[in-house]
């Protein structure tokens, strides 16, 4: 399977909410023994391998933000911890996987990575990730709403193994 990033850049005004999205593509094993671990974290540009560094999102680690469920089941973060930080990760029946960040500040700007790990009998089999950038702007140059920029077809099927 692959992970697609429909948008490579999100430009948002301060105070706005944004939903960053990744999509699971390709054949997904729906066997009873297979689940998917999905999560989000921040990373840095200029690395040899994008998304290799893992930094928290608003002090929440990738472990705090994870979802772990069957193939194309719907799921979302239920714990108060994420919601107290204005965050919610969710996954739908169609393979879309997102993180919503509320009340954006300039500090939220940066590179965000989604990670999907195929788990079989509680052990990892395959691991893929996608990357996108969030720019939070303030002042007269800031857009009134979030503006999203589609990935090139090459970028949108980011299948770099973590």
């Amino acid at each position: 399977f692959k992970v697609a990033t429909p948008y490579s850049l999100y430009v948002c005004p301060e105070g706005q909410n944004v939903t960053l999205t990744c999509r699971l593509l390709g054949p997904v094993d729906k066997g009873h023994d297979v689940t998917f671990y999905k999560t989000w974290y921040r990373s840095s540009r200029g690395e040899v391998q994008t998304c290799s560094e893992r930094r928290p999102i608003r002090n929440l680690t990738f472990q705090d933000l994870h979802l772990h469920h069957g193939g194309h089941q719907a799921a979302n973060t239920s714990h108060d911890l994420a919601q107290r930080h204005g965050l919610e990760s969710a996954s739908d029946h169609h393979g879309n996987f997102s993180i919503t960040m509320r009340n954006l500040t300039l500090l939220d700007s940066g590179l965000y990575c989604c990670l999907v790990v195929e788990i079989r009998h509680h052990h990892s089999e395959h691991r893929v990730h996608g990357a996108m950038e969030l720019q939070v702007q303030t002042g007269k140059d800031a857009p009134s709403n979030c503006v999203v920029y589609p990935s090139s077809s090459q970028d949108s099927e980011n299948i770099t193994a973590a």
């Epitope: 009873h32 023994d33 689940t35 998917f36 671990y37 999560t39 990738f62 472990q63 705090d64 994870h66 979802l67 772990h68 469920h69 069957g70 089941q73 799921a75 239920s78 714990h79 911890l81 990670l115 790990v117 788990i119 009998h121 509680h122 052990h123 990892s124 089999e125 691991r127």
Partner: antibody
């Protein structure tokens, strides 16, 4: 401090049912996979069941499959083991355990409760 | 099922001595993802088991460095370099590379 406290153990007749609970505290329960492990009177350990963090995936050995059901209530920070059609060979101390978890890969049981005793006897 | 066989059944040692416990699996427990999911647990009298070693050779946090794990494929060893009184109890190996997950029968470390 991570704490796991089992309860619900009892003396039960063969063919009977019993539900064990494991109350978790000191960590974000909904972020971790959990298991039940039992220890027979001869001190052998046997893995009984595992459930993933969200509760959507469970796994059992053949010895208990179809008779035992592991479940969890993340809102209540509680793990359960529903046991039915009990046999004398199910007599054991039942432990709940939390898994070390890296990206959904459960590679160790790093915290265990003190156990709950189940005796199946006529 | 993968059968885990531990030896010896009982290991009498003097305090300060080195102890070595063997665990053999009936088939390779190298997982398809490249990891070997072999763990060691210690159960002291009257207590629940405690994790010592995971993935063959990684010490769990707080476990003294006198404990070390090694091995590959089907043959694994737990070594205690200098046995202390608090190390006495029953040691179990455990594999999760193949389902069902299985424990060894245990090795009792006791004072000679």
């Amino acid at each position: 401090e991570v704490q796991l406290v089992e309860s619900g153990g009892d003396l039960v007749k063969p063919g009977g049912s019993l539900k064990l609970s494991c109350a978790a505290s000191g960590f974000t329960f909904s972020s971790y996979g959990m298991s039940w492990v039992r220890q027979t009177p001869d001190k052998r350990l046997e893995w009984v069941a595992t459930i993933n963090s969200g509760g959507s995936y469970t796994y059992y050995p053949d010895s208990v499959k179809g008779r035992f059901t592991i479940s969890r209530d993340n809102a209540k920070n509680t793990l359960y083991l529903q046991m039915s059609s009990l046999k004398s060979e199910d007599t054991a101390m039942y432990y709940c355990a939390r898994h070390e978890d890296y990206e959904g890969d459960y590679y160790a049981m790093n915290y265990w409760g003190q156990g709950s005793s189940v005796t199946v006897s006529p | 099922d993968v059968l885990m066989t531990q030896s010896p059944l009982s290991l009498p040692v003097s305090l300060g001595d080195q102890a070595s416990i063997s665990c053999r699996s009936s088939q390779s427990i190298l997982h398809s993802n490249g990891n070997t999911y072999l763990e060691w647990y210690l159960q002291k009298p009257g207590q629940s088991p405690k994790l010592l070693i995971y993935k063959v050779s990684n010490r769990f946090s707080g476990v003294p460095d006198r404990f070390s794990g090694s091995g590959s494929g089907t043959d694994f060893t737990l070594k205690i370099s200098r046995v202390e009184a608090e190390d006495l109890g029953v040691y179990y190996c455990f594999q999760t590379s193949h389902v069902p997950w299985t424990f060894g029968g245990g090795t009792k470390l006791e004072i000679k």
